[in-house]
Interface confidence: low
């Protein structure tokens, strides 16, 4: 097992980018190509991540830090450290098991990822629909008819749904 690091432990002197080589009398040896150690005192170097296929390299591996990947055009990252690439869809679509599908009427998606969501129900806030929703955009809620007087603000942002379970339509 690994000895407790102390002033007497030669491995504690090995900096990041090296490893404590037991085969060479615990000399600090540089990490081999395509490997890295991000902290000192390491007994081994870690293999660099390789960004292949749908992944592309955002940051090259160095002796002290791992490579970082992102996704090729048409895909987006999911997970910590871009552990997965998921297919983009167009705005107004959502990704299903059968591919990208248009949002159903009454729903929208303003991203290239994620799912279609119901339009905001303006009436839950006592407002009226100022601009109709589309597949790509939520409705814009305006003031209630009673509020339409000279000098009244004509546009407010889409209102959040007020009560659990109410489906904005």
């Amino acid at each position: 097992f690994e000895r407790t690091r102390s002033l007497q432990d030669p491995c504690s002197n090995c900096p990041a980018g090296t490893f404590c080589d037991n085969n060479r009398n615990q000399i600090c040896s540089p990490c081999p190509p395509n490997s890295f150690s991000s902290a000192g005192g390491q007994r081994t170097c870690d293999i660099c991540r390789q960004c292949k296929g749908v992944f592309r390299t955002r940051k090259e591996c160095s002796s002290t830090s791992n490579a970082e990947c992102d996704c090729t055009p048409g895909f987006h990252c999911l997970g910590a450290g871009c552990s997965m690439c998921e297919q983009d869809c167009k705005q107004g679509q959502e990704l299903t098991k059968k591919g990208c599908k248009d949002c159903c009427f009454g729903t929208f998606n303003d991203q290239k990822r994620g799912i279609c969501r119901p339009w905001t129900n303006c009436s839950l806030d006592g407002k009226s629909v100022l601009v109709n929703g589309t597949k790509e955009r939520d409705v814009v809620c305006g003031p209630s008819p009673a509020d339409l007087s000279p000098g009244a603000s004509s546009v407010t942002p889409p209102a959040p749904a007020r009560e659990p379970g109410h489906s904005p339509q």
Epitope: G81, C82, Q111, G114, I115, P118, A161, G165, P168
Partner: antibody, heavy 113, light 110 residues
Framework: SLVESGGGLVQPGGSLRLSCAAS????????MNWVRQAPGKGLEYIGI???????YYASSAKGRFTISRDNSKNTLYLQMNSLRAEDTAVYYC?????????WGQGTLVTVSS | DIQMTQSPSSLSASVGDRVTITCQSS????????LSWYQQKPGKVPKLLIY???TLAFGVPSRFSGSGSGTDFTLTISSLQPEDVATYYC??????????FGGGTKVEIK
């Protein structure tokens, strides 16, 4: 990655603003959430902010909590007002609207006199 | 308010056992499938296991699976491993941007 900050000890009735700094991706392209966990308890949902900037809240958070973000700083915020002892929890920011695939390490908020 | 009821609240099983956790929602989740499962190990941050009720998140072992639709959902661990000791949470999403977590299920090894 996501890194929360701004937690600490606050008196009942006080206010606190939590921050969540994102790196490695653009916050504005994602739906972002706040979730909290009281000591020894389960996860409790607070709210979400959409990529277009609209925020939606759990019924328990409406009126006292406000979610916002600064795209230029790639940072998400949670403004908490009129804090109560029962708001004591670890507060997490998390990414995603159909599954939260990336979480911060959390920041502890303690409400006590 | 919408309720997400997880059962059991805790369980103890042997290594290799098949473990099933259920989650019942008081209302139908959005699209019948907007249901996620998370694993939280002691002292750690929650980790996404399953989304869209049955889609395995990247890097999650295939012994985990999810099923169900509408209001009733199940997380199954086909062969329990020591590293699966954790609390598991379901989370439903609903129209109006409502999200609710279940109360959690603590899984231990006998």
């Amino acid at each position: 990655s996501l890194v929360e900050s701004g937690g600490g000890l606050v008196q009942p009735g006080g206010s606190l603003r939590l921050s969540c700094a994102a790196s490695g991706f653009s916050l504005s392209n994602y739906y972002m959430n706040w979730v909290r966990q009281a000591p020894g308890k389960g996860l409790e949902y607070i709210g979400i902010i959409s990529s277009s900037g609209s925020a939606y809240y759990a019924s328990s958070a409406k009126g006292r909590f406000t979610i916002s973000r600064d795209n230029s700083k790639n940072t998400l915020y949670l403004q908490m007002n009129s804090l109560r002892a029962e708001d004591t929890a670890v507060y997490y920011c998390a990414r995603g609207d159909y599954g939260m695939d990336l979480w911060g390490q959390g920041t502890l908020v303690t409400v006590s006199s | 308010d919408i309720q997400m009821t997880q059962s059991p609240s805790s369980l103890s099983a042997s290594v290799g056992d098949r473990v099933t956790i259920t989650c019942q929602s008081s209302q139908t989740v959005y699209n019948n499938n907007l249901l996620s499962w998370y694993q939280q190990k002691p002292g750690k941050v929650p980790k996404l296991l399953i989304y869209y009720a049955s889609t395995l998140a990247f890097g999650v072992p295939s012994r985990f699976s999810g099923s169900g639709s509408g209001t009733d959902f199940t997380l199954t661990i086909s062969s329990l491993q020591p590293e699966d000791v954790a609390t598991y949470y379901c989370q439903g999403g609903y129209s109006g941007w409502i999200y609710v977590f279940g109360g959690g299920t603590k899984v231990e090894i006998k």
